[in-house]
């Protein structure tokens, strides 16, 4: 029960931070005009990852999208590069985890499928909750280095008879959505790898028994669907996620709970 | 159509206060900004602050801050522009203008203007 | 504040002649954000309350008459009148839109000979 309790929070949590990562990927308020000891304009600005837009006083809002690739910043393009993969990984991750959830019954699936599918997930959630606070913060830090120097203009380049109204950016709504998102993402994948101790069926002494069908032969091992599908994980993975590192064939030969893990 | 309606002639003494009305019509008063302007004869004209009817947000020029006092009532669709301790300088027309939507923080409709003469 | 300068101050012209009258800001005006320039044209007729001619430093308001034209980015901003008319006589004011305060230039008073 509590597993279950355990899987179907950490489906939920990563489900909120994904649609999160989305929201934020999405939004135009990356970064904000400075308000603060600025002289006040009468116009807003604030940009996204796709599109700048600026507001009126009258609340007219006018957005244009950056309809280059490359003229771009390179951090930029990273950001946006950080973010898809993060929504991708966790789309996929959330796909696998839907079949994965103890509660839902797929013909015959074993729990070791389960098991496995749901470490999957929780990997992918992982990934992408991370991927989600890297764009963010390398964002939030791409905002942090300009506003010092956009700062020490203001102070310096007062020598010419023109002066420009320097627009400096802060951080917007959408990097603290983001960071939220990937840390929900993040905690739902954890959750996610904690479930998945649970779901694998108890230690059997014996070994994997090959029952034969006719015409062709389909082998069925206890514990042995980490070799059969793309689910499992191979032994590097092991290695992360168990405590001692054996191979293949101790682990196929003397399945316990913990490979699963 | 859109019309700003401002109150009559003033002729006050020096020290005292005087409140300028502004009555619109013509459309919704609360989702526009109301702007005032001052003009003394024969000279340019000067922008004294603004008041967004809808949340009573206001903003003003430095050198009106403690002269001028705007506030609006949404109930008549009115803005209001109080003037205190006038001295002879604070002799001029006022003009009350609506904030066009989507015109570049322009004013698009104008009224007629208040004269105020301060005068012992 | 931003400062608003108009030359000239004062202009006398034949109807149908062309005339340009220029307006100079302190800051630029220009926001990247949407690469637009907040400056707005007035045209004041004696007596009158002032009329909203030109925002954005070139957009026309509707029912403007074609002949007037803005033009201008960051600091410089001109104001064109094709072919004058008698009922061009005013006063031809430019305000800084873009900061608080907004800031109106002198004017240039437009007579017609």
């Known amino acids: 029960m509590a597993v279950t309790a355990c899987q179907g929070l950490g489906f939920v949590v990563s489900l909120i931070g994904i649609a999160g990562i989305i929201a934020a990927t999405c939004m135009d308020q990356w970064s904000t005009q400075d308000l603060y000891n600025n002289p006040v304009t009468a116009v807003f600005n604030y940009q996204g990852l796709w599109r700048s837009c600026v507001r009126e006083s009258s609340g007219f809002t006018e957005c244009r999208g950056y309809f280059t690739l490359l003229g771009l910043p390179a951090m930029l393009q990273a950001v946006r590069a950080l973010m898809i993969v993060g929504i991708v990984l966790g789309a996929i991750g959330l796909l696998v985890s839907i079949f994965a959830l103890k509660c839902i019954r797929i013909g015959s699936m074993e729990d070791s499928a389960k098991a496995n599918m749901t470490l999957t997930s929780g990997i992918m959630f992982i990934v992408s909750g991370l991927c989600a606070i890297a764009g963010v913060s390398v964002f939030a830090n791409m905002l942090v280095t300009n506003f010092w120097m956009s700062t020490a203009n203001m102070y310096t380049g007062m020598g010419g008879m023109v002066q420009t109204v320097q627009t400096r950016y802060t951080f917007g709504a959408a990097l603290f959505v983001g960071w939220v998102a990937g840390g929900l993402t993040l905690i739902g994948g954890v959750m996610m790898c904690i479930a998945c101790r649970g779901l694998a069926p108890e230690e059997t002494n014996y070994k994997a028994v090959s029952y034969h069908a006719s015409g062709h032969s389909v082998a069925y091992k206890p514990g042995g669907f980490k070799a059969s599908t793309g689910f499992g994980s191979n032994t590097k993975n092991k290695k992360i996620y168990d405590g001692g590192a054996r191979t293949e064939d101790e682990v196929q030969s003397y399945p316990s709970k913990h490979d699963y893990v | 159509q859109v019309q700003l309606k401002q109150s009559g002639a003033e002729l006050v003494r020096p020290g005292a206060s005087v409140k300028l009305s502004c009555k619109t019509s013509?459309?919704?008063?609360?989702?526009?900004?109301i702007h005032w302007i001052k003009q003394r004869s024969g000279q340019g004209l000067e922008w004294i602050a603004k008041?967004?009817?809808?949340?009573?947000?206001?903003y003003y020029n430095e050198k009106f801050k403690g002269k001028a006092t705007l506030t609006a009532d949404k109930s008549s669709s009115a803005a209001y522009m109080q003037l205190s301790s006038l001295k002879s300088e604070d002799s001029a027309v006022y003009f009350c203008?609506?904030?066009?939507?989507?015109?570049?923080?322009?004013?698009?409709?104008w009224g007629q203007g208040s004269s105020v003469t301060v005068s012992s | 504040d931003i400062v608003m300068t108009q030359s000239p101050s004062s202009l006398t012209v034949t109807a149908g002649e062309k005339v340009t009258m220029s307006c100079k800001s302190s800051?630029?005006?220009?926001?990247?954000?949407?690469?637009?320039?907040?400056l707005t044209w007035y045209q004041q007729k004696p007596g009158q309350p002032p009329k909203l001619l030109i925002y954005w430093a070139s957009t026309r308001e509707s029912g403007v008459p074609d002949r007037f034209t803005g033009s201008g980015s960051g600091t410089d901003f001109t104001l064109t009148i094709d072919s004058v008319q008698a009922e061009d006589l005013a006063v031809y004011y430019c305000q800084n839109d873009y900061t608080y305060p907004s800031t109106f230039g002198g004017g240039t008073n437009l007579e017609i000979k």
């Open positions: 800051q630029s005006l220009f926001n990247s954000g949407n690469q637009k320039n907040y």
């Open positions: 203008a609506r904030e066009g939507y989507g015109k570049g923080n322009a004013v698009d409709f």
């Open positions: 013509g459309y919704t008063f609360t989702t526009f900004w």
């Open positions: 008041i967004y009817p809808g949340t009573g947000y206001t």
